[in-house]
Interface confidence: medium
């Protein structure tokens, strides 16, 4: 969590002299309670906006907006504390609007906004606006909170932000996976424009289960410049395990901007559909046989399987 690196942070508006300050998230009014405190914010809205840094980078930011209630407590409103909590890390960042003049009623409702908290793709935040001074221990709360979920890098508008591009969001491998036979899987994908290696992670599952029955990792060396944006194809050898027929292929790039933490792309090939009323075959066997006391899969030749081609 951080604040956007440029622009003097402004909260002044006609009729109000105001300054934005860094905050420890522990306002003085917690320690020294006041007798008279303002009411809570009204209509807190959080939206995703995008902002450029001075360096030209584009970042997603939380746009926080709220209004004041139309009561006399605005006469005791000295400012506001804006707090953003990242839920998966418990990291918190606060800023304080400090009013340098007293608010007066006017015909239009007072409205405030702040768009300088940089947020991360796919992360969830709790945004809180506290009016200051904060209430006495038994007083009515004068804050409002909302949770805010930032779209991940799959979202078209997020893809072009600097943090997403740094993790490889612009690379579209357009993976196709094809079962050649019961023991071979062909994977095709488009290489990116960087001399970096890739890893293909194959995980196979039984038809209706989520416990893997086969795993394999395949290393693809860094392409030469003339191979950038070209299709690469790899044939993977499967273990011919009875019923181990649903394959998930994941491609992990190792781009210089994200190293081991680049966005991965995956494709899945389903088990071949069994006919509703299969014709009897002398040595016909079910796709997989549950056996008491054992969870391994029979390593026989799959005489009953047909070749299905699946494109993703």
């Amino acid at each position: 969590l951080r604040l956007l690196d440029h622009r003097a942070l402004v909260c002044s508006q006609p009729g109000l002299n105001c300054t934005v300050k860094n905050s420890t998230c522990l306002d003085d009014s917690w320690i020294h309670p006041r007798n008279l405190t303002p009411s809570s914010p009204k209509d807190l809205q959080i939206q995703l906006h995008f902002a450029h840094t001075q360096q030209g980078d584009l970042f997603p930011v939380a746009h926080i907006e709220w209004t004041l209630q139309t009561d006399a407590s605005i006469l005791y409103l000295e400012g506001a504390e804006l707090s953003v909590l990242q839920l998966n890390t418990n990291e918190r960042l606060c800023v304080k609007f400090q009013f340098l003049s007293m608010l007066q009623h006017h015909r239009k409702r007072w409205r405030f906004s702040f768009s300088h908290f940089v947020v991360d793709p796919g992360q969830e935040y709790e945004v809180t606006v506290h009016h200051l001074p904060k209430p006495i221990p038994d007083g009515d709360p004068n804050h409002q909170s909302k949770n805010f979920l930032v779209p991940d890098c799959e979202h078209a508008r997020m893809k072009v932000t600097t943090p997403c591009m740094s993790s490889g969001s612009l690379w579209d491998p357009n993976i196709t996976v094809e079962t050649l036979d019961t023991q071979h899987l062909r994977v095709d994908f488009t290489l990116w424009n960087e001399s970096t290696h890739y890893q293909i992670l194959l995980t196979s599952f039984p038809h209706m289960e989520n416990h893997s029955c086969f795993e394999h990792m395949h290393h693809i060396p860094a392409p030469r410049p003339e191979e950038f944006h070209q299709r690469s194809n790899v044939t993977l050898t499967l273990r011919n395990l009875k019923g181990c027929c649903r394959h998930q292929v994941q491609i992990q790039p190792f781009f210089s901007s994200c190293l081991n933490d680049c966005l991965r792309h995956s494709a899945t090939v389903s088990c071949p559909e069994m006919p509703d009323t299969p014709e009897p075959i002398p040595d016909y066997m079910p796709l997989w046989e549950p056996r008491s006391g054992s969870s391994d899969y029979k390593d026989d030749d799959d005489k009953g399987s047909s070749h299905h081609h699946h494109h993703h």
């Epitope: 809205q45 959080i46 939206q47 995703l48 906006h49 995008f50 902002a51 450029h52 584009l58 746009h63 909170s145 909302k146 949770n147 805010f148 979920l149 779209p151 799959e154 979202h155 078209a156 508008r157 893809k159 072009v160 579209d172 357009n174 993703h312």
Partner: antibody
């Protein structure tokens, strides 16, 4: 109620540059993406590109080498320039706003879904490329 | 690019008919899809956003469904003003792409 109005010459000569402006009225250009789309006679719709109010652009790769989209927030306008035009660029050109990045509320105060998509369109302007 | 296909390309129907139009994406687009109606000489008008949400002011006879690669627009009871061309639009990834359109005319 936000309204969009395209303007620009209706006739452009081959090899010249097509220039169109879209004026936004009834609302601010800030905090939205703004798109250009075209529709050739009797054909479907083709997205040309878009611009965020801050100036960040995205272009259709098929037109990228010829397209420039710019924005003037002070005039509440954004513009399209398409260079080296041919008769294939004859079309109705539309400007459109990408819908607000909406926050849909689930239970309590949880904001959980984001949606963009072109919700407000101009009425379109016909551009003919001919000598 | 994500290729959007629509079926049928045209259909003839009568007032009161139930009409279904299908849009398929060449790869998964979650629910990042809108449905648009266009009448001759007019700009497209959005009917459905997020694959299934009804645009404000659009009659409830229009509905959308689907996710991933297959999407459907349904008009539960066709009205005279519904004769038009319908397009789907994916905005999951750049370039955004439209379907080729489905023309609905009077039987």
């Amino acid at each position: 109620q936000v309204q969009l109005q395209e303007s620009g010459p209706g006739l452009v000569k081959p090899s010249e540059t097509l220039s169109l402006t879209c004026t936004v009225s009834g609302g601010s250009i800030s905090n939205y993406y703004w798109n250009w789309i075209r529709q050739s006679p009797g054909k479907g719709l083709e997205w040309i590109g878009d611009i965020y109010y801050s100036g960040s652009t995205n272009y259709n790769p098929s037109l990228k080498s010829r397209v420039t989209i710019s924005v003037d927030t002070s005039k509440n306008q954004f513009s399209l320039k398409l260079s080296s035009v041919t008769t294939a660029d004859t079309a109705v050109y539309y400007c459109a706003r990408d819908g607000e990045l909406a926050n849909y509320y689930g239970s309590g105060s949880y904001q959980f879904y984001y949606y963009y998509g072109m919700d407000v369109w101009g009425q379109g302007t016909t551009v003919t490329v001919s000598s | 690019d994500i290729l959007m296909t629509q079926s049928p390309s045209s259909l003839s129907a009568s007032v009161g008919d139930r009409v279904t139009i299908t849009c398929r994406a060449s790869q998964g687009i979650r629910n990042d899809l809108g449905w648009y109606q266009q009448k001759p000489g007019k700009a497209p008008k959005r009917l459905i956003y997020a694959a299934s949400s009804l645009q404000s002011g659009v009659p409830s006879r229009f509905s959308g469904s689907g996710s991933g690669t297959e999407f459907t627009l349904t008009i539960s009871s066709l009205q005279p003003e519904d004769f038009a061309t319908y397009y789907c639009l994916q905005h999951n990834s750049n370039p955004f792409t439209f379907g080729p359109g489905t023309k609905v005319d009077i039987k």
